[in-house]
Interface confidence: low
């Protein structure tokens, strides 16, 4: 077809283009005729007629005003019509540089996305570590200090800050204890930390009937079922995330107990260490 690009007429020997023979010119859509030495300048560029190839036949260069020659004095004002197939339009090194640059940019972008893409922070409630009990016989009140254990796993390739842990303990749908820990720790890339937190709880007032259950030795097992709720707030890149866990646990309200941490995801009957 007629798809041709416009370039300044004078040739450039860079980019591996070294001048053309008449055969080369034929290939490049340029036809040379005999040189005319009107002004004695051998090879004057104005002596070349310019012809456009359409594929089947040729058309005289429209900028030559039908003469087949470039008018004197206009050598630097006119343009040549050069086909897209001209090698000067395909400088190999520049193409390589552009491709390499694009590849490097894509690679760096991919790596940045891979390493900086936010991954999940995993919070696993391990269980009750210990429960220390005391009683107020007059008030028929039980005080339980329950220490729980959490595993927090950072799946990111950058550090994550554990801003705070809020916890509460429920007995029979009533909140009997709350705790909040602030500015806890940083967790390194792909690291895991075990965190213990203690929730002081009070079983009193409308639940004072539990005083008998927990203190009477005529009751063989003093296990009570408590619901442990914990929310961990983490921060990275100025973004905060909250992860919550809930678990029912048996706790012995009859004596001070240290538990073997159970890994099961389900309700655990925790037996004291012997």
């Amino acid at each position: 077809g007629k798809s041709l690009s416009h370039l300044p007429l004078h040739s450039n020997k860079e980019d591996g283009y070294d001048g053309v023979t008449s055969t080369d010119n034929m290939r490049n859509g340029l036809v040379s005729s005999e040189v005319h030495n009107e002004d004695g300048r051998n090879g004057d560029v104005s002596q070349f007629p310019y012809v456009e190839f359409t594929g089947r036949d040729s058309v005289t260069c429209p900028t030559c005003q039908g003469t087949g020659r470039i008018p004197r004095g206009q050598e630097n004002q006119l343009v040549a019509l050069i086909p897209y197939s001209d090698q000067r339009l395909r400088p190999r090194r520049t193409k390589l540089y552009v491709m390499a640059s694009v590849f490097v940019c894509l690679l760096l972008s991919g790596l940045a996305v891979f390493f900086l893409f936010p991954r999940s922070i995993e919070v696993k409630y391990i269980g009750v570590k210990s429960a220390y009990v005391s009683y107020d016989a007059e008030k028929r009140t039980i005080y339980l200090n329950i220490t729980n254990t959490l595993n927090i796993t950072n799946n990111n390739y950058y550090s994550v800050e554990v801003e705070n842990i809020t916890a509460q303990v429920q007995f029979s749908k009533t909140v009997i204890g709350k705790a909040r820990l602030n500015n806890i720790t940083n967790i390194g890339p792909l690291d895991m930390k075990q965190i213990d937190y203690t929730v002081p709880t009070v079983i009193a007032e409308e639940m004072s009937y539990m005083y008998d259950f927990c203190t009477l030795l005529s009751i063989k097992v003093h296990n009570i079922v408590l619901m442990m709720q914990v929310t961990v707030t983490t921060a990275y890149f100025g973004h905060s995330e909250q992860i919550s866990q809930e678990r029912y646990q048996y706790v012995d309200c009859g004596r001070n107990t240290t538990y073997q941490l159970a890994q099961s995801e389900y309700l655990n009957v925790l037996q004291p260490q012997q």
Epitope: T215, L217, I219, K220, N223, Q271, Q274
Partner: antibody, heavy 118, light 113 residues
Framework: EVQLQQSGPVLVKPGPPVKISCKAS????????IHWVKLSHGKSLEWIGL????????DYNQKFKGKATLTVDTSSSTAYMELNSLTSEDSAVYYC???????????WGQGTTVTVSS | DIVMTQSPSSLSVSAGEKVTMSCKSS????????????LAWYQQKPGQPPKLLIY???TRESGVPDRFTGSGSGTDFTLTISNVQAEDLAVYYC?????????FGAGTKLELK
């Protein structure tokens, strides 16, 4: 080695009380319940009650309330049982035994024979 | 109180035989909280204190030969002694370990034929 060393046999007249002891060794006394069990001739074992040395709490079989009094001395790791208003029905071998938490008594004393005779 | 009923009251066996004794409780000894049966078996030889053989209905106490096996759940329990030895001749008691007062069966006396 876990041991529960009981006091020797006693022969008493009906009426006045008698106190028998059970000295513990080889384990942390305050971590265990101390039980007392009666074995009468020709009868089965009967649970009298228990004491928790950690805080001195006691619990009795209703049948033995008023008959037996259980105490401990943690400084000497010794448990005591006092039997009062003795009659011939109280003649038996009395054992102390220990349990941890909600487990079955695993170690027993060698027994103290109490004979009530006029 | 939980009543423990043992049967038979006595058993005559020859050495090497397998024996089974039964224990029934008036209430379930299964703790619904931890699905554990609170029943123990004791062996008592003349002039000696009772010796714990089995707890939790089926768990053998350390040092107890594996010819002693406990089984059962709820209210019906069994103690099996395979390959009876002369030293096994004794009175065997089952015990409610579920709730106070602790109660014992009347015992099964194992005798030689």
């Amino acid at each position: 080695e876990v041991q529960l060393q009981q006091s020797g046999p006693v022969l008493v007249k009906p009426g006045p009380p008698v106190k028998i002891s059970c000295k513990a060794s080889g384990f942390t006394f305050t971590d265990y319940y101390i039980h007392w069990v009666k074995l009468s001739h020709g009868k089965s074992l009967e649970w009298i009650g228990l004491v928790y040395p950690y805080n001195g709490d006691t619990d009795y079989n209703q049948k033995f309330k008023g008959k037996a009094t259980l105490t401990v001395d943690t400084s000497s790791s010794t448990a005591y049982m006092e039997l009062n208003s003795l009659t011939s029905e109280d003649s038996a071998v009395y054992y102390c035994a220990r349990t941890y938490y909600a487990n079955s008594p695993d170690y027993w004393g060698q027994g103290t024979t109490v004979t009530v005779s006029s | 109180d939980i009543v423990m009923t043992q049967s038979p009251s006595s058993l005559s066996v020859s050495a090497g035989e397998k024996v089974t004794m039964s224990c029934k409780s008036s209430q379930s000894l299964l703790n619904s909280g931890n699905q554990r049966n609170y029943l123990a078996w004791y062996q008592q030889k003349p002039g000696q204190p009772p010796k714990l053989l089995i707890y939790g209905a089926s768990t053998r106490e350390s040092g107890v030969p594996d010819r002693f096996t406990g089984s059962g759940s709820g209210t019906d329990f069994t103690l099996t002694i395979s390959n009876v030895q002369a030293e096994d001749l004794a009175v065997y008691y089952c015990q409610n370990d579920h709730s106070y007062p602790l109660t014992f069966g009347a015992g099964t006396k194992l005798e030689l034929k």
